[in-house]
C-alpha cells in the first residue's frame, strides 16, 4: 500500500490521543535503556509503511502484535485516514484472526514495540534532514516535497 | 530515572568559542533527539537547534548556522553545542533538552550553563 | 519563521481563581502547540503537548485548547506554586519558536 495520500494530520492525531498510551502500558515495566531503535524512517509515507510492517507482520520470536489494543486502533486510524487502505487488509485481517489465539507477551515482541514508538516519534517530528524528503510539518500542500 | 546533566559555567572573550556538554542518563541516548535552546538574562527561550545522536543528522535555526555546532557522542551518551565567534548578545543560559517520547515537547532539561560573553 | 505571541506578558490572579494565557502563532501550526512553565532559577518544564495532552504528573487544574492560530492555556484554580512563566511553543515548522512567556502572579 502507498500511504502518500493518507491523511497525516489526522493519523497524527489519533497516535497521540489514544495509540501512544497503549504503546506506553504494553510497555509498562521495561527499562527505558533495555533497547535501541534500529528501523528508521524518512518521511512520512515510508513511516507508515515500517510502522505497518512492524505492527501487523508476524516476526521471529514476536507473531501476536495484531491483536493488542494499540494495533487495533492503528488499524483503525489507517482504514479512517488512508484512502483504499482496508481493501487491501483482507488477508491481514485473516492472518490477525488466526494469531488470536496466542497473547504473549515476549522480550522481542517488547523490543519490537520499543522500534515502533521509535517510528512513530519520527512520524510526528519535522524531518531532520534536509535533503528535499516530504516535509512532516505540511498540512496545507502535504503531498508536496519541498525544503524546510 | 532519566537525567540531563550539563558542564559548569563559562566565562568567554568575545570572538572565542565555548563547547557545552550534556550527558544523559536513564535512557538509551541514541533514541532520542537532543535539542538545545537559550535563554539571556531576563529573557524568554530560544531555539538554537536539534540533534539526533542515533545518526548524526542536525537542523539549526538559521540564526545560529555557522556559528553553532552540535555533535553527540554515542559511546559516552553526551550531546555537545559549540559556539563560535561568540559576542557579548550570547551571554546566555544555554539548555540542552530531550523528545518526549511521541517526539512532539522537550520533557526532561538540563539544569542549565551559563555562558557570559564578556571583555 | 512563525511568530508566537502571547498575551498578556503578565497576569496578576487571586489564589483560587482562573487564570488564562493565550498564544497566537502567525501563521496555522496545525495542533502542535506546547506549553512550558518556568520557575525563577529553574530549567523550563512540560505542562502540556500538542494543545491538550496531559504530561504524565500535570495537575488537572492545568488544561490546552485551541487550533490553527490561537491557543489558550487556562489553569483553572490558581495554586501558590503555579508562580512562573509560561511559554508556548510551536513544533510545526522550523525553526521550532516559543512564545515571549507569560508571568504569572498572585494578587
Known amino acids: 500500500y502507498d500511504f502518500t495520500n493518507c491523511d497525516f494530520e489526522k493519523i497524527k492525531a489519533a497516535y497521540l490521543s489514544t495509540i501512544s498510551k497503549d504503546l506506553i502500558t504494553y510497555m509498562s515495566g521495561t527499562k527505558s535503556t533495555e533497547f535501541n531503535n534500529t528501523v528508521s524512517c524518512s518521511n512520512r509515507p515510508h513511516c507508515l509503511t515500517e510502522i505497518q510492517s512492524l505492527t501487523f507482520n508476524p516476526t521471529a520470536g514476536c507473531a501476536s502484535l495484531a491483536k493488542e489494543m494499540f494495533a487495533m486502533k492503528t488499524k483503525a486510524a489507517l482504514a479512517i485516514w488512508c484512502p483504499g487502505y482496508s481493501e487491501t487488509q483482507i488477508n491481514a485481517t485473516q492472518a490477525m484472526k488466526k494469531a488470536r489465539k496466542s497473547k504473549v507477551t515476549t522480550n522481542k515482541c517488547l523490543e519490537q514495540v520499543s522500534q515502533l514508538q521509535g517510528l512513530w516519534r519520527r512520524f510526528n517530528r519535522p524531518l531532520l534532514k534536509q535533503q528535499g524528503s516530504s516535509d512532516y510539518k505540511d498540512d496545507d500542500d502535504k503531498h508536496h516535497h519541498h525544503h524546510h | 530515572e532519566v537525567q540531563l546533566v550539563q558542564s559548569g559555567a563559562e566565562v568567554k572573550k568575545p570572538g572565542s568559542s565555548v563547547k557545552v556538554s550534556c550527558k544523559a542518563s536513564g535512557y538509551t541516548f541514541s533514541n532520542y533527539l537532543i535539542e538545545w535552546v537559550r535563554q539571556a538574562p531576563g529573557q524568554g527561550l530560544e531555539w538554537i537547534g536539534v540533534i539526533d545522536p542515533g545518526n548524526g543528522d542536525t537542523n539549526y535555526n538559521e540564526n545560529f548556522k555557522g556559528r553553532a555546532t552540535l555533535t553527540a557522542d554515542k559511546s559516552t551518551s553526551t550531546a555537545y553545542i559549540e559556539l563560535s565567534s561568540l559576542r557579548s548578545e550570547d551571554t546566555a543560559v544555554y539548555y540542552c533538552a530531550r523528545e518526549d517520547n511521541t517526539g512532539t515537547a522537550f520533557d526532561y532539561w538540563g539544569q542549565g550553563t551559563t555562558v557570559t560573553v564578556s571583555s | 519563521d512563525i511568530v508566537m505571541t502571547q498575551s498578556p506578558d503578565s497576569l496578576a490572579v487571586s489564589l483560587g481563581e482562573r487564570a488564562t494565557i493565550n498564544c497566537k502563532a502567525s501563521q496555522s501550526v496545525s495542533s502542535d502547540v506546547t506549553w512550558y512553565q518556568q520557575k525563577p532559577g529553574q530549567s523550563p518544564k512540560l505542562l502540556i503537548y500538542y494543545v491538550s495532552q496531559h504530561y504524565t504528573g500535570v495537575p488537572d487544574r492545568f488544561s490546552g485548547s485551541g487550533s490553527g492560530t490561537d491557543f489558550t492555556l487556562t489553569i483553572s484554580s490558581l495554586q501558590a506554586e503555579d508562580v512562573a512563566v509560561y511559554y508556548c511553543?510551536?513544533?510545526?515548522?522550523?525553526?521550532?519558536?516559543f512564545g515571549q512567556g507569560t508571568k504569572l502572579e498572585i494578587k
Open positions: 511553543q510551536q513544533h510545526h515548522r522550523f525553526p521550532l519558536t
